[in-house]
Interface confidence: low
Amino acid sequence: GWVWNQFFVPEEMNTTSHHVGRLRSDLDNGNNSFQYKLLGAGAGSTFIIDERTGDIYAIEKLDREERSLYILRAQVIDITTGRAVEPESEFVIKVSDINDNEPKFLDEPYEAIVPEMSPEGTLVIQVTASDADDPSSGNNARLLYSLLQGQPYFSVEPTTGVIRISSKMDRELQDEYWVIIQAKDMIGQPGALSGTTSVLIKLSDVNDNKPIFKESLYRLTVSESAPTGTSIGTIMAYDNDIGENAEMDYSIEEDDSQTFDIITNHETQEGIVILKKKVNFEHQNHYGIRAKVKNHHVDKQLMKYHTEASTTFIKIQVEDVDEPPLFLLPYYIFEIFEETPQGSFVGVVSATDPDNRKSPIRYSITRSKVFNIDDNGTITTTNSLDREISAWYNLSITATEKYNIEQISSIPVYVQVLNINDHAPEFSQYYESYVCENAGSGQVIQTISAVDRDESIEEHHFYFNLSVEDTNSSSFTIIDNQDNTAVILTNRTGFNLQEEPIFYISILIADNGIPSLTSTNTLTIHVCDCDDSGSTQTCQYQELMLSMGFKTE
C-alpha cells in the first residue's frame, strides 16, 4: 500500500525549492525499480517529484490566500514490467498560514449620518475589517479595533467595530467629523499587522434653534391707493438650523385695526406684509403692528428650544394720494315726463373731494345734446323729450376737481322719460276689404285691430265707431269686440259693382287715456262679382291682375 503522512507547505517560503514530503509504496524495497509520478493541477509546475525516490518539492512560493490546498494524484510503476505497483491514489497538500495579510476594510469609504445632540452610547455605524489569513490558524485573523482619531466625541467597541457617540455634538458648531479606525490582527499582540479606515460622520440637523428676527423694528410704507392684497414689504428672521428645521411661519401677533396680514414665502423664508383692508390717509395715517415667527415643524421633545417665539414691531406709514372726486351715490335714476319744455329740472348729482384740501368740483355730461349740468350738479333738459323716440337716457356724468383737473370720476345717470297720452290709436295695418255683389246682410267683411304708440300704465283699451256720416249711410255697420278688435259687417243685401264699385268707410278709434284721444281711419271696401259660393278670392285675384295691367274676361 501507499505510505505517506499529511503534507504541509508553509506559504511565502523564499527558498527556490522546499521539501514537502515523500510518497512511498510499502512494496518499494529500494532497488530503484519503482518510478513515481505526480499528476493533477500544480504537478510539474508548482510541485516536482523525484520520480526515483518519491520526494516531492515545492518550487514556487505559495500564497495560502490565493490557494490553500492542492489535490494531486500519485502513481507508482515498476519500470521493469511497466505495470502499476499500486492503484492510482489522490492526496492533498495543504498550504499552512503565516500572518502575512493586514486587516482590510473592504466596504470603505464609510459614511454615516447621526442626529446632532444624540446622547452618549448612540450607535453610529459598524465598520468591519477582513483579514485574508486563516481564522483557524492561531490569532492571524483575530482582530481588535481601536480609535486613532475622533476622541472625545466617538468610541469604538474593540471586538465588534461598532462606533458609538461618547459626547454630545452640536451641528451648528461643527457639522461633520472624520474618524480613523485601526484594526489589528493577532489580537493586538507583537508582530500584529494593522489596517485603517476613515469614517465620515455627518451630523444631521435637529430643530434645536428657533428663528429670531434680524431687526426689532421694521418701518414700512403703504400708499392709500394700494388695493387689498398688496405686498407692502418684507421682514426676515434667521434660524441656525437647516432644511425643514429652518422653515418658518410668520404671523400677526398684534394688529388692533385688523388691517394687515403676514404670509410666509417658503422659498425665501421671508415674511411678506400684506394689506388686508384698504387704508385711508385722511382717516388714519400710521399703524403699529407686532409680528411673530415660529418654526413650521417642531418635534414635541424639542419644544424646550421654542418656548417663546421671537417678535418684532412693524411701523407702517400711510402715504397720501390725491384721490378723485367721490359721488354720494354709485349711480342715479331720475324721471321726467315727456313733452316738458326745454330747461326743465331733471335731478341733482353731488360729488366731493375726499382729500383734506376739499377742492371745488366741476360737472360735465359726456356727449349729450339733450341734457345739461351746471356747477351745482343740477341736470336740466336742453330739448323737449319724446318718450316714443327714447324712453331711457343713459348719461355719463363726470366730476372734475378744480385744483387738479386730472382727478376725474364718472358715474352713470339713468333718466326715464315718463309717458303722457299724446298719440291716438290707429289701425295696426293697412286694410283692403272685399264684398260680393250678392252678399247678404250681416256678413263679416273685415276684422280690424288698433295700436297706440303711447305706453299704457294699465292695459290699452280702444273704442271703435263708424263716423256719423257712415252710420247714416247704413251700408255697413261695426261691432266692437271689447278686446281691442272690431268687425265690419254688411248692413244690407246686395251691392252693385257698376253703380258703387268702392266704399270708403271712416272708422273712429278712441283710447282710454286721460284725456282720451281719437283718430279717424279709412277702410276701403271693393265690391266684387263673385261666384255662387260667395267667395271673394276671385275678386282679389282680379284686383291683383288689374293692378299689374292685365284684363280679365
Epitope: D107, E108, P109
Partner: antibody, heavy 122, light 108 residues
C-alpha cells in the same frame, strides 16, 4: 470574461413603459456599479443612470422622474424601466459596467453590452 | 451639467497621419475623470482612455490622452485603417455623467 447582454421588447407604444434587462455572465454582479446608456439613431450617447449591487441608484436629472433601475443579484441581472415614453425615447439602449471595483467614485465604462434597439411608435 | 464640446465635428485624414481630437468641458473636470471611447458602426463603444491619459487594457500605444481642467486631447500618432470611427469623450467627475457629441474620423 465578464459579458453583458441586454434584452427586452423592441417596440413600445407612446405613453407606455419601456422595460429592459441586462444579464451579467462570466462574473458576479456584486461589487460593481452598473449603468444604462442610450443612443438615439445617428446621435450621441446619453447616460441614463446606474445601480450598485446593493440597490442604491443614481439617475440623470433629465430623466429622473421617469426612470427606475433595479437589481436581482440572485439572477445576476439589472433592469431599466422608463415610463410615459414618447418618440424622443427611441434609441439604442446599452448596459455597461464601471471599471472601478467596489464602492468609490465613478469610473469609465470598461465593459458594454452590444445594445438593444427600442422604437417608440403606435 | 458639464457640457462637453468636441471638435472638430468631422476630421478627414489618411492612414499614417496623426489625428488630434479635442474635448472642451464647460467647467473643470474634477480629478481628470475623463474617458475616450471609440465606436464603429453597429458596435458598442470601446474604452480607449480613462483618467484622461491611462490606456485601457489591450489598447495600442498609438492612442494617447492628455489634458486636465477643461481641455483634453486624444491623439492617434499613426492612423491605421481600423481607426476610422466615431470618438466620444466622457466625463465622470461630476454627476450626471455626460458625453461629448462625438468626432467622426473619416478616411480622406
Amino acid at each position: 470574461q465578464v459579458q453583458l447582454q441586454e434584452s427586452g421588447p423592441g417596440l413600445v407604444k407612446p405613453s407606455e413603459t419601456l422595460s429592459l434587462t441586462c444579464t451579467v455572465s462570466g462574473g458576479s454582479i456584486n461589487s460593481y456599479y452598473w449603468s444604462w446608456i442610450r443612443q438615439p439613431p445617428g446621435k450621441g450617447l446619453e447616460w441614463i443612470g446606474y445601480i450598485y449591487y446593493i440597490g442604491s441608484t443614481n439617475y440623470n436629472p433629465s430623466l429622473k422622474s421617469r426612470v427606475t433601475i433595479s437589481v436581482d443579484t440572485s439572477k445576476n441581472q439589472f433592469s431599466l424601466k422608463l415610463s410615459s415614453v414618447t418618440a424622443a425615447d427611441t434609441a439604442l439602449y446599452y448596459c455597461a459596467r464601471d471599471s472601478r471595483y467596489r464602492s468609490g467614485w465613478y469610473d469609465a465604462f470598461d465593459i458594454w453590452g452590444q445594445g438593444t434597439m427600442v422604437t417608440v411608435s403606435s | 451639467d458639464i457640457v462637453l464640446t468636441q471638435s472638430p465635428g468631422t476630421l478627414s485624414l489618411s492612414p499614417g497621419e496623426r489625428a488630434t481630437l479635442s474635448c472642451r468641458a464647460s467647467q473643470s473636470v474634477a480629478g481628470s475623470y475623463l474617458a475616450w471611447y471609440q465606436q464603429k458602426p453597429g458596435q458598442a463603444p470601446r474604452l480607449l482612455i480613462s483618467g484622461a491619459s491611462s490606456r485601457a487594457t489591450g489598447i495600442p500605444d498609438r492612442f494617447s490622452g492628455s489634458g486636465s481642467g477643461t481641455d483634453f486631447t486624444l491623439t492617434i500618432s499613426r492612423l491605421e485603417p481600423e481607426d476610422f470611427a466615431v470618438y466620444y469623450c466622457q466625463q465622470y467627475g461630476k454627476s450626471p455623467i455626460t458625453f461629448g457629441q462625438g468626432t467622426r474620423l473619416e478616411m480622406k
